[in-house]
């Protein structure tokens, strides 16, 4: 029986060009974590395997860094990074737990400030 719960950072926002840490935490279970997958919509970003450590998908190698812990750091954020992110915990004997994070990437405050106070 699956007794665990996944706590996530929930809905978060970050500035364009900056970085953000995606974090999930599995609690209330003694199940052994085999692997944690990080996905953006349906694209696999990274895997943290209990045996073998981290594997970052080649297409994200430049902008994704492993950690801290089982979390994932996204760097050089663009507006296109806005969307849903999922942490998928493969555990034994429980099975698969999924957590969801929504990231909104905002134009930097400098850009917003400049846009608001344009001289006609």
């Amino acid at each position: 029986m699956m007794t665990g719960t996944i706590e996530t950072t929930g809905n978060i926002s970050a500035e364009k060009g900056g970085s953000i840490i995606l974090q999930c935490h599995l609690s209330s279970t003694t199940a052994q974590v085999t692997q944690v997958n990080w996905e953006q919509q349906d694209q696999l970003l990274a895997i943290c395997n209990a045996d073998l450590g981290w594997h970052i998908s080649p297409s994200f190698k430049d902008r994704v860094a492993p950690g801290p812990g089982l979390g994932l750091t996204l760097q050089s954020l663009t507006v296109n990074d806005t969307g849903e992110y999922f942490c998928i915990y493969h555990t034994y004997p429980d099975g698969t737990y999924t957590g969801r994070i929504f990231l909104e990437v905002l134009e930097s405050s400098v850009a917003e400030h400049g846009a608001r106070f344009q001289i006609p």
């Epitope: 699956m2 052994q32 085999t34 692997q35 997958n37 349906d42 696999l44 895997i47 395997n49 209990a50 045996d51 073998l52 594997h55 493969h90 034994y92 004997p93 429980d94 099975g95 698969t96 999924t98």
Partner: antibody
């Protein structure tokens, strides 16, 4: 090209032992979770056991727990299934299978090896 | 254990037909469902994973859908090589159970 070739099947008496092997090629064997799945004659598929890439973690179906041992030798690119205290209901074709890196499904399977438990 | 029930158990169809096979889980399995094709005397082949993702090299006529407890595998236009047995498998919780299979035969 990914290839998985099982061997070691045969006829064994109830209570006997058998060791199955699965020789892997065409991929980085040590990076992938592997499993054994069996299929009794004319029946469906049954998951038997799984082992992590480094061999640290092993998982078993209740029907084989305590009797079967899954292991791997990454230096030889080979997966094993040691089967002890065999029963008639263990009669099946045994397949080794490689999981996707994501661990979402078994993407390649061997051709299978038949194990017959009979007196 | 999660029980996986496929329907129908067998199905007769003709080349060119559109065919749908359903798989029902005894409890919520989110999208953790795979579909496999098996021909007599051969090993299973992965068609679909994560309910709707096509495995590399699988013809586009095969598609999967569903989430929660109800899933479908659709073959849009049957080809002669598609006559086989199809299995669903859940990856939500151990043991990772399979459906009993659907045998697709030539009408």
């Amino acid at each position: 090209e990914v290839q998985l070739v099982e061997s070691g099947g045969g006829l064994v008496q109830p209570g006997g032992s058998l060791r199955l092997s699965c020789a892997a090629s065409g991929f980085t064997f040590s990076s992938y979770i592997m499993s054994w799945v069996r299929q009794a004659p004319g029946k469906g598929l049954e998951w038997v056991a799984t082992i992590s890439g480094g061999g640290t973690n092993t998982y078993y179906a209740d029907s084989v727990k305590g009797r079967f041992t899954i292991s791997r030798d990454n230096s030889k690119n080979t997966l094993y299934l040691q089967m002890n205290s065999l029963r008639a209901e263990d009669t099946a074709v045994y397949y080794c299978a490689k999981w996707l890196l994501s661990y979402y499904a078994m993407d390649y399977w061997g051709q299978g090896t038949l194990v017959t438990v009979s007196s | 254990d999660i029980q996986m029930t496929q329907s129908p158990s067998s199905l007769s169809a003709s080349v060119g037909d559109r065919v749908t096979i359903t798989c029902r889980a005894s409890q919520n399995i989110n999208v953790w469902l795979s579909w496999y094709q098996q021909k007599p005397g051969k090993a299973p082949k992965l068609l679909i994973y994560k309910a709707s993702k096509s495995h590399t090299g699988v013809p586009s006529r095969f598609s999967g859908s569903g989430s929660g407890t109800d899933f479908t595998l659709t073959i849009s236009s049957l080809q002669p090589e598609d006559f086989a047995t199809y299995y669903c498998q859940q990856g939500q919780s151990y043991p990772y159970t399979f459906g009993q299979g659907t045998k697709l035969e030539i009408k």
